[in-house]
């Protein structure tokens, strides 16, 4: 029951996380700025991964997509790639984890197969979360670095003239959404990996064999084949191993973890 709960919770947390990563990737507010430091006019510029916008205090907004690939900053391309890889891995992970859920029965899928699928999806969620966190962090670092580069370059040129507008860049909402979403996906992945351990059947390093002492009820033929037993008729004429050992599958189809040697 605890395993099912852990797996189910891991799935839900990851689902929310991946939805958040998709939302963050699509959002325009990755960085925001108060253009020309002019609070009276309150015109804001904000950038996303796909376009940048200018918004008036009245709410009117004008956006422009990044129509070039060659002119894009390399780091922006890298962040895009990280976020897309995160989404793709997360989506595949979700697909795999749906079939891995213990509460869902698909044909005669064994627990070992479900355990493997749970582990696979868990790892995918972890990598997906890390990609999102890395992407958002790279973007945030880029904002901070370029802000200081602009500030350091502020008084250059002839006569110490101001050569840049001191624009206030702030982290946009998408950065926080991305960090939280990446974290949730990561946590969900860890939970799936933990659930996998509980799902995996306990394997032993030996073949389960029951030994029975030879008594009056066991007769032997010279050819080394069992003639009859006290446990039922020997229709299969099975080979006796270790001179008195009876293979487990004579009575049961599959070895059980409750068999004792």
């Amino acid at each position: 029951m605890a395993v099912t709960a852990c797996q189910g919770l891991g799935f839900v947390v990851s689902l929310i996380g991946i939805a958040g990563i998709i939302a963050a990737t699509c959002m325009d507010q990755w960085s925001t700025q108060d253009l020309y430091n002019n609070p009276v006019t309150a015109v804001f510029n904000y950038q996303g991964l796909w376009r940048s916008c200018v918004r008036e205090s009245s709410g009117f907004t004008e956006c422009r997509g990044y129509f070039t690939l060659l002119g894009l900053p390399a780091m922006l391309q890298a962040v895009r790639a990280l976020m897309i890889v995160g989404i793709v891995l997360g989506a595949i992970g979700l697909l795999v984890s749906i079939f891995a859920l213990k509460c869902i029965r698909i044909g005669s899928m064994e627990d070992s197969a479900k355990a493997n699928m749970t582990l696979t999806s868990g790892i995918m969620f972890i990598v997906s979360g890390l990609c999102a966190i890395a992407g958002v962090s790279v973007f945030a670092n880029m904002l901070v670095t370029n802000f200081w580069m602009s500030t350091a370059n502020m008084y250059t040129g002839m006569g110490g003239m101001v050569q840049t507008v001191q624009t206030r860049y702030t982290f946009g909402a998408a950065l926080f959404v991305g960090w939280v979403a990446g974290g949730l996906t990561l946590i969900g992945g860890v939970m799936m990996c933990i659930a996998c351990r509980g799902l995996a059947p306990e394997e032993t390093n030996y073949k389960a064999v029951s030994y029975h002492a030879s008594g009056h009820s066991v007769a032997y033929k010279p050819g080394g084949f069992k003639a009859s037993t006290g446990f039922g008729s020997n229709t299969k004429n099975k080979k006796i191993y270790d001179g008195g050992a009876r293979t487990e599958d004579e009575v049961q189809s599959y070895p059980s973890k409750h068999d004792y040697v």
């Epitope: 960085s31 950038q47 940048s52 602009s150 840049t164």
Partner: nanobody, 122 residues
Framework: QVQLVESGGGVVQTGGSLRLTCEIS????????MGWFRQAPGKEREFVAA????????WYADSVKGRFTISRDNAKNTVYLQMNSLKPEDTAVYYC???????????????WGQGTQVTVSS
């Protein structure tokens, strides 16, 4: 290399008009939010007016509202500042400014022209 060249400055009487022009080369004008700044002798450079990429959003400093009009022609890679009802306090060197679309994501994030002198005599 992106370059901004201003023109149209000169000496004008109080109440007169001037039209400043800023031409951008080395880049598509539509990728930049364009602005005009001015610097009077012994003073800091101050914001005058700005216009968004498509020209649908414009904003002005309080001191020039109703007198100055900023416009752009992306096809000609040119930005204009129409200055009417000029006052002596409008005397300054006027600079054209281009703020890149990527903002802080790229470096350099903005470009400046060399400036054009506007003198309003009383």
């Amino acid at each position: 290399q992106v370059q901004l060249v201003e023109s149209g400055g000169g000496v004008v009487q109080t109440g007169g008009s001037l039209r400043l022009t800023c031409e951008i080369s080395g880049a598509a004008l539509s990728s930049y939010t364009m602005g005009w700044f001015r610097q009077a002798p012994g003073k800091e450079r101050e914001f005058v007016a700005a216009i968004s990429w498509g020209g649908s959003i414009t904003w002005y400093a309080d001191s020039v509202k109703g007198r100055f009009t900023i416009s752009r022609d992306n096809a000609k890679n040119t930005v204009y500042l129409q200055m009417n009802s000029l006052k002596p306090e409008d005397t300054a060197v006027y600079y054209c400014h281009a703020e890149g679309q990527f903002g802080a994501l790229s470096y350099p994030k903005d470009y400046w022209g060399q400036g054009t002198q506007v003198t309003v005599s009383s």
